[in-house]
Amino acid sequence: AVNGTSQFTCFYNSRANISCVWSQDGALQDTSCQVHAWPDRRRWNQTCELLPVSQASWACNLILGAPDSQKLTTVDIVTLRVLCREGVRWRVMAIQDFKPFENLRLMAPISLQVVHVETHRCNISWEISQASHYFERHLEFEARTLSPGHTWEEAPLLTLKQKQEWICLETLTPDTQYEFQVRVKPLQGEFTTWSPWSQPLAFRTKPAALGKDT
């Protein structure tokens, strides 16, 4: 038997993936656990194996279909269960009735690239991945730039209140190494949260021309 408090949190990426994290205070040594998804109105069900991400939490991804297929809608309710093996039987450790479009977290933006760089400016573009066509262009972004000698947490957040998949960073220092990240969020959903930050894009501004006033 497992004692202690348990937390079971899942997010839908708006297309064909539900990612779940289960935390359990009590010790669960070599127990095999999984997440089982049972939709109320679909002919499929899906299972994923929970793998440890820390001493007391496990995670897995329910792959519902091809990455860009629209597997769920606002009326779907998916019963999600954490099942752990106890001898020859499975024990239900956690359960929730999951409303996918109230619990959205999109995939991190991908394909970040420097479009154009100057001494004081840099134009960067990116793409969104596996976002539902329901959102159309109605997404918002946050971006941050890591300057030398600072941490990501210190970086000011730039907010883009529309589906603008590029940014022009200004007032940069010449011949300086920077890193850039972006994340995305839809407008829909009571418990919707920001996507993970994108992989950082490193870039360097051009040096100032010699003999010129900068």
């Epitope: 109105r41 629209q70 809608t73 009326v75 779907d76 329901y134 839809p186």
Partner: nanobody, 119 residues
């Protein structure tokens, strides 16, 4: 402005059939579900049938095997073919559409059409 217009209601005898239709029109939207609900005096509105993207139809227990829902997500129409009707099916039938407009989802309802089944 979004509008849902229902048609096809009326009176029919026990064992008869009726076909209800509903069309959504108006400004730019994306529909992810359309369906039918019904209300009888003194009771809450209840699901008759609906159909979401991906072709998943859901039916109320009392109509399974007698009613068939068809949705055209291109024309934004939904029809309800009702057969083997009985007096318990009498009520006001409402069309409902789940619509995405400017990145948010909302439910929209028609005005309702009366269905009366006499014995």
């Amino acid at each position: 402005e979004v509008q849902l217009v229902e048609s096809g209601g009326g009176s029919v005898q026990t064992g008869g059939s009726l076909r209800l239709s509903c069309v959504v029109s108006g400004s730019h939207f994306i529909s992810d579900v359309m369906g039918w609900y019904r209300q009888v005096p003194g009771k809450q509105r209840e699901l008759v049938a609906d159909m979401a993207d991906g072709g998943s139809a859901k039916y109320g227990d009392s109509v399974k095997g007698r009613f068939t829902i068809l949705r055209d997500s291109v024309k934004n129409t939904v029809t309800l073919q009702m057969s083997s009707l009985n007096p318990e099916d009498t009520g006001v039938y409402y069309c409902k559409a789940g619509l995405w407009i400017t990145g948010r989802h909302s439910d929209y309802w028609g005005q309702g059409t009366q269905v009366t089944v006499t014995s």
